[in-house]
């Protein structure tokens, strides 16, 4: 079957990294600089992605594979394939329209990206707070209050209702 297909379509013989050149009797020509073909039998090569500015090159373009970009230090990727870069914040912060802001009391963020999330409400699971939460860390829930010695406290502050964080606009 492969041989039959080759006889019918000479382009099917062109490997990745080349294209079937209609201008030259359908011979296989190498992809020009800054282009690639990742599969065989292609009639054109695709332009390489360019990583500039806030993007940096994670993987160089080759004749058989596209370039891959990520973000420069201090930024993280958004979108599949890193189509946008967003500023990092510190742990215990979130990115708002006005820049990086500390998490409100009762919320935390243990990453450099994303929004501050409410501490776990241990009492909802019938447990008590073993370790208090901080801006950077969630509370650690321990045994249920009934398991504690008399007089032990298990006050969990209510998680405030809040809007999701915003990227700067």
């Amino acid at each position: 079957f492969e041989r039959t297909r080759s006889l019918q379509d000479p382009c099917s013989n062109c490997p990745a990294g080349t294209f079937c050149d209609n201008n030259r009797n359908q011979i296989c020509s190498p992809c020009p600089p800054n282009s690639f073909s990742s599969a065989g039998g292609q009639r054109t090569c695709d332009i390489c992605r360019q990583c500039k500015g806030v993007f940096r090159t994670r993987k160089e373009c080759s004749s058989t594979s596209n370039a891959e970009c990520d973000c420069t230090p201090g930024f993280h990727c958004l979108g599949a394939g890193c189509s946008m870069c967003e500023q990092d914040c510190k742990q215990g912060q979130e990115l708002t329209k006005k820049g990086c802001k500390d998490c409100c009391f009762g919320t935390f963020n243990d990453q450099k990206r994303g929004i501050c999330r409410p501490w776990t409400n241990c009492s909802l699971d019938g447990k008590s707070v073993l370790v208090n939460g901080t801006k950077e860390r969630d509370v650690v829930c321990g045994p249920s209050p009934a398991d504690l010695s008399p007089g032990a406290s298990s006050v969990t502050p209510p998680a405030p209702a809040r809007e999701p964080g915003h990227s700067p606009q």
Epitope: Q50, N66, L78, G81
Partner: antibody
Framework: QVQLQESGPGLVKPSETLSLTCTVS????????VHWIRQPPGKGLEWIGA???????DYNAAFISRVTISVDTSKNQFSLKLSSVTAADTAVYYC?????????WGQGTLVTVSS | DIQMTQSPSSLSASVGDRVTITCKAS??????VSWYQQKPGKAPKLLIY???NRYTGVPSRFSGSGSGTDFTLTISSLQPEDFATYYC?????????FGQGTRLEIK
Amino acid sequence: QVQLQESGPGLVKPSETLSLTCTVSGFSLTTYGVHWIRQPPGKGLEWIGAIWSGGSTDYNAAFISRVTISVDTSKNQFSLKLSSVTAADTAVYYCARDDGSFANWGQGTLVTVSS
Amino acid sequence: DIQMTQSPSSLSASVGDRVTITCKASENVGTYVSWYQQKPGKAPKLLIYGASNRYTGVPSRFSGSGSGTDFTLTISSLQPEDFATYYCGQTYSYPLTFGQGTRLEIK
């Protein structure tokens, strides 16, 4: 809050040099670059060029012989210079922060080229 | 340069309608396409990045799809504030290029 604001003369004579500034606040010029994009009246958007956070530049080949983009970090300003202007350069000129997808733009400034 | 061709160039629709705008790239640009909304006298506003990601604060009635050379912006139920001009743009390769725009008018 991230803000960009273009400013400069609204009227430039043919053959002269168009000079615009983009004053920014809410972000560091050493962290982000800026793009310049223009829009002739009633037409689409055209990318002119960009200056990256390290100070290097990239220009659209259509403008390369007459465009210069620079930065003055002490004034929190980027600048665009376009020489030998003609009526075809009449447009609203925008600066936009470099984040990969143009999430933050200035309000734009109209430049008319006329004698 | 990569050409971005939008269609239609203008479109009349009513509040509540579902509207689709298409953008065709002259080369494969992966998913590196953004969509912008522009109202008269204002700067463009980012709606969609990476072909399908809604930017912060953009209503869920706006959605984007596509990859390679064919892309669409869909507004599921038009609101009065959606009447504007929409542009696609590719952020894949330099020079960055934009479509010629689609003007969305009230029928």
